[in-house]
Every structure is written in structure tokens, then in C-alpha cells.
């Protein structure tokens, strides 16, 4: 019994005069804007996006929107076309949704914020944006009160008119419309494809958060990893950092390249490598391989408990006003606009701490 190393778990609620606001990462579920896909992009990545078959032709499709089909047919006329160099990172960066176009309004603690307050970050969804990343020398924002007026409120246009037509199932095309959001500590990178939650257009979504500080014990009392990150890419250890690190190693080993969101200096995967190796390999690792990426719990971590609720936007009463305000049709407003409110429920945090049962 003496060698059992039991632990107990202590729960506590701690009042705070202020709390550091979390990082908020958001991604449009559509990876590439239709208007930004050039002839050269289509030539190189058309098959990956299921817009072309392997003979560089538009597939026989009855599902196509006439206007989009016309534009694509023009772009897919490769007679006498000289392909230019192509880079997936540059493609994601250039053709991904731009926060300056998506962000219709932004307020933090009642003060106006802007697209400049969002830092570009690449994830498996492509070009995404983090509010309050705490990077580039910017201080981490604080909040002094709980409740909706003391957090982040943004109105976004998801730009469904820019969504790529879906003529086949690929990892780069989406059946859904909206954004994916992850609320996370500034000390860990986003892992939004696995850990994010969805926010739909046509709704105002309220996210009430509670900060939870978890303290685990190392062996033999517990299983946490007390060591600092053994990584070329991340400064501090987190399960997310470990998994991204591991996924990168797996892809480089299997495919000799990395996806655009992965750190390091391996070459970026080409569209062919995405289709033939990177996408299926990463899907296999995430879904099937239980052993390759075993990431230990850090001894200290901050997570955010969330409660979500939604109301309809626009109301019948406001539809005309919003349409006029943003110079769009009422239908467009209903299909594209969302409001996201993220705030602390109360100004306290919860500590969940493992303690040695006896010394």
C-alpha cells in the first residue's frame, strides 16, 4: 500500500479582479474563394478541389451553377496555356478568405476593434485568424467583468457567394457553411479541425466561458509530462503542440513534405502530394493510428469551459435595415451574417488540482 502513490483531486473557485481573455481562432469552412482561383491555380489544384478530372477537364456535372460553370469553363481552357510555378502555401494565403472582407463589426469590452487585431494563422482549414494571440509584441487583453458587454462581439459575413462549388468529396471542400471557432490559451497553438466548434450563419451565438486551471501530478502520483517541449517548433509543451509536432513528423516520414499549416522546413506538399499522400495519411493518423502520436498531459494547463446558446439573426424586423446598412439583399443577410459573442460568465476561475494523498 505504501508504494501506491495515491492522489486526491482538489476543486476550488478563485475570485479574480481581472482575467486574461483567451485567444479566439476562427476559420471560414470554405478554404478558397472562388473569385481568387486563377487559371494557374485551377491547372495545378483543380483535381485536388474536384473541379477538374485527371485530364484537366471540367467533369460532366449537372450540379453546377450556370454562372460559376461559365467562369470555370473559361479558366479551364488550357489551350496554349503555359503553367507557371505554383505553391500551396501561397495559394492558401492569397485565395483564403480575408478577415478585412469578412469582419463587419468588432467590439472588445465595448471598444471598437478591427481586422488589424486578428493575426493570420494557418490550420488544416487553410487561412484562419486569431484574435488576442498575444504575439508580435501585443499584450494579452484582460477583462474586468463577466457578461456579454465585457468580452468579444464580432459580426461576420461568411461570403457564401465565394464558396467553391462541390462536385466531389475531398478534404479541401466543405459541405457546410459557416465558421469554426476555437477558444484556447495563448500558450498553445490552435488545433481547430479537431477541437473547434461550429458557428452557423443566420444566428447570433453566445459563448459563456469559464477559465479552468488544471494542475496534474507527475509520475508516480499521476501521468503528466513535467519536461519542457522537446521541439524545434513550439516554446511550451501542450497536447496540441505535441500533436501538431507529431503529425508533421508523420507526414514528412510518409510523404516527404508538410501541409501548409505545419511548422518546419520540409517542402510544402504539392497538390498531387496532398491528394495522393498527405490528406489520406493525416486522415489515417487522426482516425486509425492509436499509437504514433501519444501525447502526455502537461502538468499545468488552462482550458475554457463553454456554454453555447443561439438566437436568430436577422429578425423579420431588422432584415431590411441590415440589408440596407450592408448594401446586400435580405436573402444574402440571412445566408451569410453571423454574430459571435464570447465572454466570461463570472470573473473567477476554477482550479482542479491533483495533490499527493500523503507525503
Amino acid at each position: 500500500y505504501y508504494f501506491c502513490y495515491h492522489h486526491v483531486t482538489k476543486l476550488d473557485e478563485v475570485a479574480a479582479s481581472q482575467l486574461t481573455f483567451p485567444a479566439v481562432t476562427l476559420c471560414n469552412l470554405n478554404e478558397f474563394r472562388f473569385s481568387q482561383v486563377s487559371k494557374n491555380d485551377l491547372y495545378h489544384a483543380g483535381e485536388l478541389l474536384a473541379l477538374l478530372n485527371n485530364r484537366y477537364e471540367i467533369p460532366d456535372t449537372q450540379m453546377a451553377d450556370e454562372k460559376q460553370l461559365e467562369i470555370l469553363q473559361d479558366k479551364a481552357n488550357f489551350r496554349s496555356f503555359k503553367p507557371k510555378p505554383f505553391n500551396m502555401r501561397e495559394f492558401y494565403d492569397r485565395a483564403g478568405h480575408d478577415i478585412r472582407d469578412m469582419l463587419l463589426s468588432c467590439h472588445f469590452r465595448g471598444e471598437a476593434c478591427s481586422a488589424e487585431d486578428f493575426k493570420v494563422v494557418f490550420t488544416r482549414y487553410g487561412k484562419c485568424y486569431t484574435f488576442n494571440s498575444g504575439q508580435d509584441g501585443r499584450p494579452r487583453l484582460k477583462t474586468m467583468k463577466g457578461g456579454t458587454g465585457n468580452g468579444l462581439e464580432i459580426m461576420l459575413d461568411i461570403q457564401q457567394d465565394e464558396y467553391l462549388p462541390v462536385w466531389g468529396e475531398t478534404d479541401e471542400t466543405s459541405f457546410e457553411a459557416g465558421i469554426k471557432v476555437q477558444i484556447h490559451s495563448q500558450d498553445e497553438p490552435p488545433f481547430i479541425d479537431q477541437l473547434g466548434f461550429g458557428v452557423a450563419p443566420g444566428f447570433q451565438t453566445f459563448v459563456s466561458c469559464q477559465e479552468q486551471r488544471l494542475i496534474y501530478l507527475p509520475s508516480p502520483w499521476g501521468t503528466c509530462n513535467a519536461v519542457t517541449m522537446d521541439s524545434d517548433f513550439f516554446d511550451s509543451y501542450s497536447i496540441t503542440a505535441c500533436r501538431i509536432d507529431c503529425e508533421t513528423r508523420y507526414l514528412v516520414e510518409n510523404c516527404n513534405c508538410r501541409m501548409v499549416h505545419m511548422p518546419g522546413d520540409a517542402p510544402y506538399c504539392t497538390p498531387e502530394q496532398y491528394k495522393e499522400c498527405a490528406d489520406p495519411a493525416l486522415d489515417f493518423l487522426v482516425e486509425k493510428d492509436q499509437e504514433y502520436c501519444v501525447c502526455e498531459m502537461p502538468c499545468n494547463l488552462t482550458r475554457y469551459g463553454k456554454e453555447l446558446s443561439m438566437v436568430k439573426i436577422p429578425s423579420k424586423a431588422s432584415a431590411k435595415y441590415l440589408a440596407k446598412k450592408f448594401n446586400k439583399s435580405e436573402q444574402y443577410i440571412g445566408e451569410n451574417i453571423l454574430v459571435l459573442d464570447i465572454f466570461f460568465e463570472v470573473l473567477n476561475y476554477e482550479t482542479i488540482e491533483q495533490k499527493k494523498a500523503y507525503e
Partner: antibody, heavy 116, light 107 residues
Framework: EVQLLASGGGLVQTGGSLRLSCAAS????????MSWVRQAPGKGLEWVSG????????YYADSVKGRFTISRDNSKNTLYLQMNSLRAEDTAAYYC?????????WGQGIRVTVSS | DIQMTQSPSTLSASVGDRVTITCRAS??????LAWYQQKPGKAPNLLIY???NLESGVPSRFSGSGSGTEFTLTISSLQPDDFATYYC?????????FGQGTKLEIK
């Protein structure tokens, strides 16, 4: 180049034992699960057994459970299949394969004949 | 265990024909399905992995589709070299299982 080279087959009496080996090269062996697949003469393919990268988890087809043991030595980059209490129906070509998002490559196939 | 049912067992066709082989899983296997071609005395040769991905070096006349429980291998225009036996394999969960095979022969 990723390669798998199987060895250890041969002729054995019913009830006898045999150990197959599969030497791997060209990839980080310990990172990948491995499997054995067999094919009886004139018959289809049958998955026999699988093992995780560390060797900590093993899996068997019902037809060989309790008689066959899969193992690996990651320091030698080698996969093994210990076959005991062999039966006539175990006569087959045995292939080792690297498990991943695609099962590629397969070993060249090693013939095991169980005679009575 | 997941059962894989391949049909037909034998298929007679001519050079230039379009042929389709079907594989049905007894429960969902997501998209973790592979197709192999095997010639007598040889090891199986991977054609398609993860339902629809063409293995490097395999002619583009081969294609795969499906999801969940229903999958197909299509050869758009049969060539003399394509007469062989074809197997599907699920690798979604242990025990991994193969279809019983489809022998493609010259009509």
C-alpha cells in the same frame, strides 16, 4: 526504397511449428503497425494477424487465435510470426505488409506447406 | 468481424469494355477500402487506396468510388493486361478482411 523481405517458410508436419520473419528497410519500422496476410492455393486473401508499432497490441484472425503469435524486434527492424500446432489448412503463401493509409509494400510471399 | 462481399465472383468481358466490380461491407468502414489486382503466382498489387486514391503507376482507367458500406472499382476501358483477379480489403478495423475475389476473364 521501402522494402519487406520474408523468410522462414518450408515444409512442416501437421502439429509442427515454424517461425516466419519479415525484414524491413527504408522506413522507420517502429512507427508503423504491421500485418501478416496469407493465401491458400487457389483461394482468396486472408488477413492473419497484426501488431502495433511498439508491439504492445496484437490482433489475430479467429482461425489462428491461440496457435499463432505475432511479434516484432524494432531494434532489428524485423517482424515475426510464430506458428504452432500447424494444420493442413494453414498451407498457404504468407505475406507481410506495412499498415498505413495504404498497405504498401507487401513482402514477396513465403510458402508454408503443412503435410500429414 | 466485418464481412466483405464482392460481386460478381466471375466476370467475362472483352477488351475495350467498361467493367464495374462491387464490394459491400457488413457495416460502415468509412472510406478505408483498398482494391488489389493479383495475377497467378504473384503478390497482390495495390490499385486503389482509401476508396478512390489511385496508387502511383496505376493506369488512370482504374477508378474507385463509394463510402460507408458500398464501394465500386471501375475499369473504364479493359486492356489485355487487366485480366486478373481483383480483391477489395477493408482496413477500418481489426480483423481486417478481404472480399472473396472477382476473377475477370476474357469473353
Amino acid at each position: 526504397e521501402v522494402q519487406l523481405l520474408a523468410s522462414g517458410g518450408g515444409l512442416v508436419q501437421t502439429g509442427g511449428s515454424l517461425r516466419l520473419s519479415c525484414a524491413a528497410s527504408g522506413f522507420t519500422f517502429s512507427s508503423f503497425a504491421m500485418s501478416w496476410v496469407r493465401q491458400a492455393p487457389g483461394k482468396g486473401l486472408e488477413w492473419v494477424s497484426g501488431i502495433s508499432g511498439s508491439g504492445g497490441s496484437t490482433y489475430y484472425a479467429d482461425s489462428v487465435k491461440g496457435r499463432f503469435t505475432i511479434s516484432r524486434d524494432n531494434s532489428k527492424n524485423t517482424l515475426y510470426l510464430q506458428m504452432n500446432s500447424l494444420r493442413a489448412e494453414d498451407t498457404a503463401a504468407y505475406y507481410c505488409a506495412k499498415e498505413a493509409y495504404k498497405w504498401q509494400p507487401w513482402g514477396q510471399g513465403i510458402r508454408v506447406t503443412v503435410s500429414s | 468481424d466485418i464481412q466483405m462481399t464482392q460481386s460478381p465472383s466471375t466476370l467475362s468481358a472483352s477488351v475495350g469494355d467498361r467493367v464495374t466490380i462491387t464490394c459491400r461491407a457488413s457495416q460502415s468502414i468509412s472510406s478505408w477500402l483498398a482494391w488489389y489486382q493479383q495475377k497467378p503466382g504473384k503478390a497482390p498489387n495495390l490499385l486503389i487506396y482509401k476508396t478512390s486514391n489511385l496508387e502511383s503507376g496505376v493506369p488512370s482507367r482504374f477508378s474507385g468510388s463509394g463510402s460507408g458500406t458500398e464501394f465500386t472499382l471501375t475499369i473504364s476501358s479493359l486492356q489485355p493486361d487487366d485480366f486478373a483477379t481483383y480483391y477489395c480489403q477493408q482496413y477500418n478495423s481489426y480483423s481486417y478482411t478481404f472480399g472473396q475475389g472477382t476473377k475477370l476473364e476474357i469473353k
